[in-house]
């Protein structure tokens, strides 16, 4: 009789996470009598996966009926595979012993590799907004994939970016891996509607990459341009001055009118108009009663946009050209929320 050999015909087995792995093992002889055990790894630290003789192994089932007469098939199935199950599995024949069975012979081992899909990429931008012409960094992270090979690309509005750095961790062998990439993006004034996309391709995705997106509207701040103009005379002693606040983003904006440096009125941008590029325009006006002034008036439109330091634009209102009304030192009524009468 030839001595028993333990045959593990598969050097390696590749299984998708969540699936069932079949690890094949047959013995070439019924002799010696004794159970089979399955281990992950070798040596003193090996992990018991299945013991025919005793124990409870809820994830493991045997392929054949071990009580079947003359059974020599000791293949097992392991259910609900995760990346943590990766490793080399050994089918080991034990010889009946007293009081304990004795290890007799091991199979050559089967390496179980687990294909695990990467998690949906998460793209995050800078903590604070930045203005056009500045370079900002975006990060993209995806976790839990195996094997290690993975491809990551960055796009801005469909155009592939080249300025990025990517790391896959850990560097050595692991049950699963993570990818971290940082891309640099130069902002332009037209980027309110722009998107940055991180695209991850992996063998488990069957050519259908995962994408994570970030809207540059969360990142960009387009500061306004101001223009103060004097409108044609509404009435003989009134002048309408407007402050055009153009091309700003985001909408959060507060405007203050100053007369000769003194605060006249403050208001918050409400009914704005949106431009095609996603920026906003807004206009505020001031009704000035010039008859109340003996000297020229310096009108300043001061805008605080998105919590940034205020920007302003001034307009000198010449009053010498207008006849002065004597004794008119009481306030005229406001004629609208954007109108202001000056004494």
């Amino acid at each position: 009789e030839e001595e028993l050999q333990v045959i593990q015909p598969d050097k390696s087995v590749l299984v998708a996470a969540g699936e069932t792995a079949t690890l094949r093992c047959t013995a070439t002889s019924l002799i010696p009598v004794g159970p089979i055990q399955w281990f992950r790894g070798a040596g003193p630290g090996r992990e018991l996966i299945y013991n025919q003789k005793e124990g409870h192994f809820p994830r493991v089932t045997t392929v054949s009926d071990l009580t079947k007469r003359n059974n020599m098939d000791f293949s097992i199935r392991i259910g609900n595979i995760t990346p943590a199950d990766a490793g080399t599995y050994y089918c080991v024949k034990f010889r009946k012993g007293s009081p304990d069975d004795v290890e007799f012979k091991s199979g050559a081992g089967t390496e179980l590799s687990v294909r695990a899909k990467p998690s949906a990429p998460v793209v995050s931008g800078p903590a604070a907004r930045a203005t056009p012409q500045h370079t900002v960094s975006f990060t993209c992270e995806s976790h839990g994939f195996s094997p290690r090979d993975i491809t990551l690309k960055w796009f801005k509005n469909g155009n592939e970016l080249s300025d990025f750095q990517t790391n896959v961790d850990p560097v050595g062998e692991s049950v699963s891996y993570s990818i971290h990439s940082t891309a640099k993006v130069v902002l332009t004034r037209e980027d309110v509607h722009s998107q940055v996309i991180c695209e991850v391709a992996h063998v488990t995705l069957q050519g259908d990459p995962l994408r994570g997106t970030a809207n540059l509207s969360e990142t960009i701040r387009v500061p306004p341009t101001l223009e103060v103009t004097q409108q044609p005379v509404r009435a003989e002693n009134q002048v309408n001055v407007t402050c055009q606040v153009r091309k700003f983003y985001p909408q959060r904006l507060q405007l203050t009118w100053l007369e000769n440096g003194n605060v006249s009125r403050t208001e918050t941008a409400s009914t704005v108009t949106e431009n095609k590029d996603g920026t906003y325009n807004w206009m505020s006006w001031l009704l000035v009663n010039v008859s109340a002034h003996r000297d020229d008036v310096k009108l300043t439109c001061q805008v605080e946009h998105d919590g940034q330091p205020a920007v302003s634009k001034s307009h000198d209102l010449k009053v010498s050209a207008h006849p002065k009304e004597q004794g008119s030192n009481t306030a005229a009524e406001n004629t609208g929320s954007n109108e202001r009468n000056i004494y």
Partner: antibody, heavy 119, light 110 residues
């Protein structure tokens, strides 16, 4: 280690039935066949039947087909053999034995239950 | 059914000598290269103990003075050298089909 525990004795009346137990420990009960063997005083061994605890598949010696009924209780890791319509010819020691190699052999034995049929 | 016939029914062997017990099957108990014969030892008041499986393989913890041989229908259990503790009844069993036992051989040590 493998152990098969059997009660020492059973005294029963002729015509009655008796249910013998065999409690297994030290191994996975459902992975190995249990055999039952009869031995009358001063006589040889007679194989009665065997049961696979995983699915209660049974094989009987034709001689005992109408005498013995094998069952298992997986929750308590116990095998049972019920003997019916007892006569003095059923007085014997009854052993349970476990087949460790799926060879239809008897690797580990209980100590046996002595059944006495007497009025 | 396969009938196993053991001989002799009893024998007496001097300490240190060889004891030979025969077991003959009514038809072959061989299959797929294996001989489905098992040998047991039983001492009074004790359950049987497996000595040899598949005709020639010593069970765990069985002294090397026990050996089994044979194929097809004729099988032999040898004990050499016999020791006092070997006094017992020896049974052969087959499992080519459903199991049956031989009638037993009682070994006495002189």
């Amino acid at each position: 280690q493998v152990q098969l525990q059997q009660p020492g004795t059973e005294l029963v009346r002729p015509g009655a039935s008796v249910k013998l137990s065999c409690k297994a420990s030290g191994y996975t009960f459902t992975n190995y066949w249990i055999n039952w063997v009869k031995q009358r005083p001063g006589q040889g061994l007679e194989w009665i039947a065997m049961i696979d605890p995983s699915d209660s598949e049974t094989h009987y010696n034709q001689i005992f087909k109408d005498k013995a009924t094998l069952t298992v209780d997986k929750s308590s890791n116990t095998a049972y053999m019920q003997l019916s319509s007892l006569t003095s010819g059923d007085s014997a020691v009854y052993y349970c034995a476990m087949d460790y190699g799926s060879l239809y052999a008897m690797d580990y034995w209980g100590r046996g239950t002595s059944v006495t049929v007497s009025s | 059914d396969i009938v196993l016939t053991q001989s002799p029914a009893s024998l007496a062997v001097s300490l240190g000598q060889r004891a030979t017990i025969s077991c003959r099957a009514s038809k072959s108990v061989s299959s797929s290269g294996y001989n489905y014969i098992f040998w047991y030892q039983q001492k009074p008041g004790q359950p049987p103990k497996l000595l040899i499986y598949l005709a020639s393989n010593l069970d765990s913890g069985v002294p090397a003075r026990f050996s089994g041989s044979g194929s097809g229908t004729d099988f032999t259990l040898n004990i050499h050298p016999v020791e006092e503790e070997d006094a017992a009844t020896y049974y052969c069993q087959h499992s080519r089909e459903l199991p049956t036992f031989g009638g037993g051989t009682k070994l006495e040590i002189k």
